[in-house]
């Protein structure tokens, strides 16, 4: 999975922070998405999971930013192998888990 430069990763982290902090009602009406394996291909896998949420303006910028990291389609089998088989979680939890992981990557300097 492509690795964004530090500023791009920082922008994505800030957007996820905004989502979690501004959350009033259940995020995206409590929609469920596939949980993903955060150890590899996180940007494209996160996109493929979150894109299944429609009509939720709160996460559209995040969807577009993730699509900026992998703008052209990954091969068909690539995402299914990154998905945690048959496990779905709420969008709010997905965003929180993704945020924790991206902050860890940022601290470790994994953005070059």
């Amino acid at each position: 999975s492509p690795v964004p430069p530090s500023t791009a990763l920082k922008e994505l982290i800030e957007e996820l922070v905004n989502i979690t902090q501004n959350q009033k009602a259940p995020l995206c009406n409590g929609s469920m998405v596939w949980s993903i394996n955060l150890t590899a291909g996180v940007y494209c896998a996160a996109l493929e999971s979150l894109i299944n949420v429609s009509g939720c303006s709160a996460i559209e910028k995040t969807q577009r930013m993730l699509n900026g990291f992998c703008p052209h389609k990954v091969s068909a089998g690539q995402f299914s192998s990154l998905r945690v088989r048959d496990t779905k979680i709420e969008v709010a939890q997905f965003v929180k888990d993704l945020l924790v992981h991206l902050k860890k990557l940022f601290r470790e300097g994994q953005f070059n």
Partner: antibody, heavy 118, light 111 residues
Framework: EVKLVESGGGLVKPGGSLKLSCAAS????????MSWVRQTPEKRLEWVAS???????YYPDSVKGRFTISRDNARNILYLQMSSLRSEDTAMYYC????????????WGQGTTVTVSS | DIVLTQSPASLAVSLGQRATISCKAS??????????MHWYQQKPGQSPKLLIY???NLESGIPARFSGSGSRTDFTLTINPVEADDVATYYC?????????FGGGTKLEIK
């Protein structure tokens, strides 16, 4: 307001080179993928190149090895280095913010004209 | 390469009437149930503008008179009602398979 301004077009002989630039403003440049799309004199649109926010590049076979897309994230500028130019490369070249395969080319510049002729 | 065939090449519609533009792909452009087909409007002397993404999603700021539908290989852009400002050429584009390709365009005129 998103603004994309292309420059660098002109008349070049077959086999020659040209470098196009696109100055971006009004959005966080580094967070988005960018592309070049061209429009032929017959008004057909053709995707030319894309670059991800992380610097990964994508090209159709028609320009692979001849064109190179790059970005300067510090200056918010997108580039297209074109070499071994052919008459069929004659077109209006547009810079576009690419919001990815799920969202399409979200914003377009006004274009710069490239004419390849002897 | 995926070939996109638009029809008609041109059409003339009366103000207030419905305009329907078709785009047929040589193979499916669906990915995990999402249609990777987008529609653009290009007014004379201007650059293209995104109208619809993923077959049926209206881009921000685009009037609800524009709508898109379809899946797999058959897609439709509908403008209802047509206004004078809609005079333009409309293009479909697929992003399911590299190289990304565009349709040949449909020119809309007012009758």
């Amino acid at each position: 307001e998103v603004k994309l301004v292309e420059s660098g077009g002109g008349l070049v002989k077959p086999g020659g080179s040209l470098k196009l630039s696109c100055a971006a403003s009004g959005f966080t440049f580094i967070s988005y993928a960018m592309s070049w799309v061209r429009q032929t004199p017959e008004k057909r649109l053709e995707w030319v190149a894309s670059i991800s926010s992380g610097g990964n590049t994508y090209y159709p076979d028609s320009v692979k090895g001849r064109f190179t897309i790059s970005r300067d994230n510090a200056r918010n500028i997108l580039y297209l280095q074109m070499s071994s130019l052919r008459s069929e490369d004659t077109a209006m070249y547009y810079c576009a913010r690419l919001d990815g395969y799920y969202f399409g080319f979200a914003y377009w510049g006004q274009g710069t004209t490239v004419t390849v002729s002897s | 390469d995926i070939v996109l065939t638009q029809s008609p090449a041109s059409l003339a519609v009366s103000l207030g009437q419905r305009a329907t533009i078709s785009c047929k792909a040589s193979e499916s452009v669906d990915n995990y149930g999402k249609s990777l087909m987008h529609w653009y409007q290009q007014k004379p002397g201007q650059s293209p503008k995104l109208l619809i993404y993923r077959a049926s999603n209206l881009e921000s700021g685009i009037p609800a008179r524009f709508s898109g539908s379809g899946s797999r290989t058959d897609f439709t852009l509908t403008i209802n009602p047509v206004e004078a400002d809609d005079v333009a050429t409309y293009y479909c584009q697929q992003s399911n398979e590299d190289p990304w390709t565009f349709g040949g365009g449909t020119k809309l005129e007012i009758k």
